[in-house]
């Protein structure tokens, strides 16, 4: 099995990931591994010579680039934060800051915007990936409530008065918790009619 550089008449190389076709000499040459770049191009008698990317630069893939890409920080003005640093083998890894979602995508997220508030009685539907889309608010399920306008507040279960040795004074709704009272306390006047029944 031929090792680069080797002649190729059909302009294709056996290992597309790690080799490339050099048209000037009609040969297949080695690409440089991630974290390196081409410091000397190949010829018929000599394979590609690779060198390590300098500090603050990277190449992510097997390549035949003559330079490394400059590391760039995540742009906080665009609502992005850093989750992993740039290394010679990968670019800086960014994501939307907490409370934001990706509003513009071009191979990666370029711009984040604030998540919409979910009104009382609802909560944001949980997504597989945080920051991927805006909130989709869904009603609290039975026996739960949520009493704020917030992008992140979750519906909480209604308080069970009996667990605290109390009795229910007013039932919970989707927007409010159960109101409990001491069993010895009289009911407020507006509710005494219901009690008599």
């Amino acid at each position: 099995q031929a090792v680069p550089p080797y002649a190729s008449e059909n302009q294709t190389c056996r290992d597309q990931e790690k080799e490339y076709y050099e048209p000037q000499h009609r040969i297949c040459c080695s690409r440089c591994p991630p974290g390196t770049y081409v410091s000397a191009k190949c010829s018929r008698i000599r394979d590609t010579v690779c060198a390590t990317c300098a500090e603050n630069s990277y190449n992510e893939h097997w390549n035949y680039l003559t330079i490394c890409q400059l590391c760039r920080p995540c742009d906080p003005v665009m609502g992005l934060e850093e989750i992993a640093p740039c290394t010679s083998k990968r670019k800086t890894q960014c994501r939307c800051q907490p409370g934001m979602f990706c509003a513009a995508w071009a191979l990666e997220c370029t711009h984040c915007e604030l998540l919409s508030d979910c009104p009382p009685g609802t909560e944001a539907e949980l997504k597989d990936e945080v920051g991927k889309g805006n909130n989709h608010c869904v009603p609290c399920k039975a026996g739960h409530f949520q009493n704020t306008s917030s992008p992140s507040a979750r519906c909480q279960p209604h308080t069970r008065c009996e667990n605290q040795g109390l009795v229910e004074a007013a039932p919970g709704t989707a927007q409010s918790d159960t109101t409990c009272k001491n069993p010895l306390e009289p009911l407020p006047p507006e509710m005494s009619g219901t009690m008599l029944m």
């Epitope: 920080p73 003005v77 640093p85 290394t87 083998k89």
Partner: antibody, heavy 116, light 107 residues
Framework: QVQLVQSGAEVKKPGESVKVSCKAS????????LHWVRQAPGQGLEWMGW????????QYNEKFKGRVTITADKSTSTAYMELSSLRSEDTAVYYC?????????WGQGTTVTVSS | DIQMTQSPSSLSASVGDRVTITCKAS??????VAWYQQKPGKAPKLLIS???YRYSGVPSRFSGSGSGTDFTLTISSLQPEDFATYFC?????????FGQGTKVEIK
């Protein structure tokens, strides 16, 4: 050559704040991240956060969020780390360090003692 | 946060010995691991980055290996100046985390 020179030792009382400086030279200050790492007596190393002087944006370890502020002055190529609401367990040597696949460059360290 | 568990916490060895220190990450960190040497009262010194690349000026007796979750620092023939504390560090994701250190003492 790259040099990071830190300010001198500090003695503080619980509840006070401390601000440590780190003056960089020998490279372009605005294009490299500067981190802060601390080491309590006889303990391991603990990463606190970083600043990218190019856009003066900082990011912190959640453990210190709200208590630590990292800033930078581009005109003097100096980074600062301020830690507030000090407690005795903040007694440590505080280092600034420039990163690239680890920390190849470190300041000499600043000892901060918190004692009543 | 990613935990870096280093072992042993201390070891006694003689000049000329081969010394191995291991570091285990709580999740996959690729090859994004560095090793440092620290002497009392001094800042740590970078020995190895990208798990196995010796930093410039570091003697060839120091070598690193591993990827994913298991990493090793080896000193092939311990020299008098190597008695120090060694730390591993992951720089794969924030927050960066360090191992608790291994103190190499004279037997």
């Amino acid at each position: 050559q790259v040099q990071l020179v830190q300010s001198g030792a500090e003695v503080k009382k619980p509840g006070e704040s401390v601000k440590v400086s780190c003056k960089a030279s020998g490279y372009t200050f605005t294009t490299y991240y500067l981190h802060w790492v601390r080491q309590a007596p006889g303990q391991g190393l603990e990463w606190m956060g970083w600043i990218y002087p190019g856009n003066v944006h900082a990011q912190y370890n959640e453990k210190f969020k709200g208590r630590v502020t990292i800033t930078a002055d581009k005109s003097t190529s100096t980074a600062y780390m301020e830690l507030s609401s000090l407690r005795s367990e903040d007694t440590a040597v505080y280092y600034c360090a420039r990163s690239w696949e680890g920390f190849p460059y470190w300041g000499q360290g600043t000892t901060v003692t918190v004692s009543s | 946060d990613i935990q870096m568990t280093q072992s042993p916490s201390s070891l006694s060895a003689s000049v000329g010995d081969r010394v191995t220190i291991t570091c285990k990450a709580s999740q996959n960190v690729g090859i994004n691991v560095a090793w440092y040497q620290q002497k009392p009262g001094k800042a740590p010194k970078l020995l190895i980055s990208s798990a196995s690349y010796r930093y410039s000026g570091v003697p060839s007796r120091f070598s690193g290996s591993g990827s994913g979750t298991d990493f090793t620092l080896t000193i092939s023939s311990l020299q008098p100046e190597d008695f120090a504390t060694y730390f591993c560090q992951q720089y794969d994701t924030y927050p960066f985390t360090f191992g608790q250190g291994t103190k190499v003492e004279i037997k």
